[in-house]
Structures are given as structure tokens and as C-alpha cells.
């Protein structure tokens, strides 16, 4: 059976600057030339889109200018970076991959990466 499997790390800790990076890797059942990658956030039973990008195989991944995501692609692997995260953004981030062209279409969804974000402690006032 032809199926698409998506792998991503179970847990990632965001940096003190609110940046989290993880790899989303997919096993492609066909030779896709156009791929769409979407990052979804699942909180309770609600799923919301964080960012999405479509790329041609061999080309760079380009998110919209106002997106909080950036990324690079290499073969069937996408390196995703989410910026501007705060403690309230802690949650499960799901990588969704769609093989858009040529047909047939394939859908793949990862199990999600739990991203933990800890807001940095404010610097104490110091006397000089």
C-alpha cells in the first residue's frame, strides 16, 4: 500500500529568545514536485494553523513575509523554525505534509512535537 508517513520529534524546548526548531521528515510514496507543509497547533480538541508554505522540490521553502515560521528543505526533510514564542504558546505542534503535484494527492500528518516555552526571568536592576 502506498502511504505517506511523517516523523517529527516528540519534544522540543524553545530557546530563551522564544525560538523553537524541529525537523519534519516524510516518506514519500511518489515523486512529488510540489509539496505543501503546514504547522498546526493542537490545544484541547481545537486545531489552528500556525503557518504554511508550498515549495517545489529542489527549491527553498518560502513562508509569507508576516509568518512566524521560517524553514529550509532538503529532499524529504524540512527544517522548521518558529519564532516569537511565549510561555502561553506551549503546546503540541503538528507537521502536516501534502503532496500536491503531480497526482495522486497524498496527505501525511505527524504525531506532533510538544514545544515547551519558558518566558525568561526579567533581569534584576543592578546598581553600578
Amino acid at each position: 500500500c502506498k502511504a505517506m508517513h511523517v516523523a517529527q520529534p516528540a519534544v522540543v524546548l524553545a530557546s530563551s529568545r522564544g525560538i523553537a526548531s524541529f525537523v519534519c521528515e516524510y516518506a514519500s510514496p511518489g515523486k512529488a514536485t510540489e509539496v505543501r507543509v503546514t504547522v498546526l497547533r493542537q490545544a484541547d480538541s481545537q486545531v489552528t494553523e500556525v503557518c504554511a508554505a508550498t515549495y517545489m522540490m529542489g527549491n527553498e521553502l518560502t513562508f509569507l513575509d508576516d509568518s512566524i515560521c521560517t524553514g529550509t528543505s532538503s529532499g524529504n526533510q524540512v527544517n522548521l523554525t518558529i519564532q516569537g514564542l511565549r510561555a502561553m504558546d506551549t503546546g503540541l505542534y503538528i507537521c502536516k505534509v501534502e503532496l500536491m503535484y503531480p497526482p495522486p494527492y497524498y496527505l501525511g500528518i505527524g504525531n506532533g512535537t510538544q514545544i515547551y516555552v519558558i518566558d525568561p526571568e526579567p533581569c534584576p536592576d543592578s546598581d553600578f
Epitope: C1, A3, R36, T38, E49, K96, Y106, G108
Partner: antibody
Framework: QVQLVESGGGVVQPGRSLRLSCAAS????????MHWVRQAPGKGLEWVAV????????HYADSVKGRFTISRDNSKNTLYLQMNSLRAEDTAVYYC???????????WGQGTMVTVSS | EIVLTQSPGTLSLSPGERATLSCRAS???????LAWYQQKPGQAPRLLIY???SRATGIPDRFSGSGSGTDFTLTISRLEPEDFAVYYC?????????FGQGTKVEIK
Amino acid sequence: QVQLVESGGGVVQPGRSLRLSCAASGFIFSSYGMHWVRQAPGKGLEWVAVIWYDGRNKHYADSVKGRFTISRDNSKNTLYLQMNSLRAEDTAVYYCARSGSLGAFDIWGQGTMVTVSS
Amino acid sequence: EIVLTQSPGTLSLSPGERATLSCRASQSVSSNFLAWYQQKPGQAPRLLIYGASSRATGIPDRFSGSGSGTDFTLTISRLEPEDFAVYYCQQYGTSPWTFGQGTKVEIK
């Protein structure tokens, strides 16, 4: 609230054309794939066509390929189905449906009836 | 194309009884991308279950889905009067998207 409303159905003669519309509201239309699904009287559901996001990628069921064209206008939050060379077997209720974030068809319109008869 | 076969075609039960509906795929359904829909006469289908076992928003917990690979089941633990309808399974992991032929749950 999230809603899909179809229009454009009616009675048409074999070989003629019809265009269906589906007006979307309550969500970011361009972020979702949109499908047409039909149901012949007393029969089950049959997937017809899909159009993705920016409208460049489309897929069709073999039964309508070359006769039907799916399109969308993201600025108007509207999905279309242009149906040409209609046949009696195209008689059905046509539903538009949203492909949810996790893939299943989570929102459906109320349907519009298309009858192809001489 | 993945062909989905539902059984039985019709299920005659009384309110309060348990309903078990089956959906069998001609080949393995990718990542369990299988959904169940409920349709009442004159109405559009409504999503009940996605991902084989996850309940859609607002669906009562008497509806549950299970299964993987090629065999899937929708269970309604205690039938309420409003549950008598036609139920369809669907795979959405690859094109073409396909539906089963439906199972009608009717009042005995």
C-alpha cells in the same frame, strides 16, 4: 459562524451547461482545500472534485474529468463548479465541503439540486 | 482507488441498543485517515469521527470509532431517537477520495 451555502442548481437539458457556486463565511477561505461531493437520488455520496488553497492544484473524479471544472475566487470567498456536457447520470444534489485542517470534510453546505432531463 | 465496503446495508435496532457498523477497505488506509459521517433525510452529511477514532467537535461520546489498516468500526453505545440515519465511511489519505455505500440504521 462557519458556513457554506451552495446555489446555481436547477433543471437542465442533456448536453447543456450549469455553474454552481458555494459561498463561504466564518473562516479563512484561502487556507483550506474545497471539495464538491454529489449524491444521486436515493444513492450514496460520490466525491467529484477538489481545489487547493491558491487554486493552482485540482483533482477530479474520472466520471467528470474533461467535463467539469472546479475553480475558486479567494477574494470573494467563493467556490465554483462549471459543469459542461451534462448527462442524465449527473442528476444529483451537489454539496460543497471543506477539507479540515486534519483532512476530513468538517464543514458541508446544505446542497443544491441539479436535474438533467430532456 | 481505495474501495470501501460497509456492512450491514441496513441495521434494524431499538432505541437504547448498541449499534456496530463495519467499514472494510480494499487496501490499507494511509495513517488511518478514515472518517465517519452521519446523514439524515434531506440534510447534508455531518462529520462524526476522523482519524478512525477521534470525535469531531460537538459529537456525543456515545459515538466511537476504532480500527486500523483495512478494518474499521463505528459504534453507537446506546441509540438515541436522533441517531437513526445513514452512516458513511470515507478515506481521505489519497486521491481519489472515496466513500462507502452507507449503512442505514433504522428503528426496529
